[in-house]
């Protein structure tokens, strides 16, 4: 019987109660590997979850989060609320970044501004709650006579692509 069961492909299960050994998975269930004795129930993407990929007889459904939430955990096991840029999500809710920190994402915590002087540079554009400081040339490069005729355009820090 074990040898016969190993012949059952993905999308079926080994049904010991029927003369036909391999039975297709019932609706809303799947088996992703061969030789299974049961099919697994499909995941349902409800509430804050939305369906990214429908369940098939050989693969589980995949969920994503609705707008205003982001995934956490393997296979998006949890949805966590977004905050606005310039905020961080604490365990008590969204909170504005403190002075000297920023967050250019809708998730995560506030990050300290870059300290330009540590790399021997000067601040070209001040930081905000939503954007990091932009560092420019070293202070020595900005001494009279050393600066260029046209000052560099302020650079804006794009947000990083979430995973």
């Amino acid at each position: 019987l074990q040898d016969l069961c190993s012949n059952c492909p993905a999308g079926t299960f080994c049904d010991n109660n029927r003369s036909q050994i391999c039975s297709p998975c019932p609706p809303n269930s799947f088996s992703s590997a061969g030789g299974q004795r049961t099919c697994d129930i499909c995941r349902q993407c409800k509430g804050v979850f939305k369906t990214r990929k429908e369940c098939s007889s050989t693969s589980n459904a995949e969920c994503d989060c609705i707008s205003g939430y982001h995934c956490l955990g393997a296979e998006c096991s949890m949805c966590e609320q977004d905050c606005k840029q310039g905020q961080e999500l604490t365990k008590k809710g969204c909170k504005d970044c403190c002075f000297g920190t920023f967050n250019d994402q809708k998730r995560g915590i506030c990050r300290p501004w870059t300290n330009c002087s540590l790399d021997g540079k000067s601040v070209l554009v001040n930081g905000t709650k939503e954007r990091d400081v932009v560092c420019g040339p070293s202070p020595a490069d900005l001494s009279p006579g050393a600066s260029s005729a046209t000052p560099p355009a302020p650079a804006r820090e794009p947000g990083h692509s979430p995973q």
Partner: antibody
Framework: QVQLVQSGAEVKKPGASVKVSCKAS????????MHWVRQAPGQGLEWMGW????????NYAQKFQGRVTITRDTSISTAYMELSRLRSDDTAVYYC?????????????WGQGTLVTVSS | SYVLTQPPSVSVAPGETARITCGGD??????VHWYQKKPDQAPVLVVY???YRPSGIPERISGSNSGNTATLTLSRVEAGDEADYYC????????????FGGGTQLIILG
Amino acid sequence: QVQLVQSGAEVKKPGASVKVSCKASGYNFSGYYMHWVRQAPGQGLEWMGWINPNSGGTNYAQKFQGRVTITRDTSISTAYMELSRLRSDDTAVYYCAREPGYYGSGLDYWGQGTLVTVSS
Amino acid sequence: SYVLTQPPSVSVAPGETARITCGGDDIGDKRVHWYQKKPDQAPVLVVYEDRYRPSGIPERISGSNSGNTATLTLSRVEAGDEADYYCQVWYSSPDHPGVFGGGTQLIILG
């Protein structure tokens, strides 16, 4: 798939400098901060600093400020960590590690490590 | 506080449950990450943001965090779980953004 490949082992004299490289592939290098972490023999993990490859903005642990410089070359998707005025207690394995797109989460991909030995 | 305190070692028999703690002032207000580190290998993220597992990490590894203690739990431990485990927290301070605990050696008995 995401990969971080670091330069080979180095042996340096006290007072010298070392520059370790970390070449990224399999993702948009400019979109993710890169961190450096080290582990000395018999010791724990120690965070050293990060760089935003997009802007070049950095932050360093206070312990290393003035001795460490993290840079990048976006044209070849490579981050560098240079440590100067080396001492024997800088002997360690140095790792680069990627932040997953936002600050406050775990470092999801790591380089294989680079052993730096400081010995006279 | 920027100090995360871990026990130097935890010993457990195969098949049993291991609990590794990470102590810090009000650590329950922070998001704690855990890494597994085996000799001559790079660290591997096993739990992030207190309790979430990256893809490929078995369900028997879990995390929790409240008050002054975060805990990494490994149930039904196997010989392959023997490693050092480090907790880690990010801060918004410019001088100490990244802090690791001292590490805990998980010893599998027998």
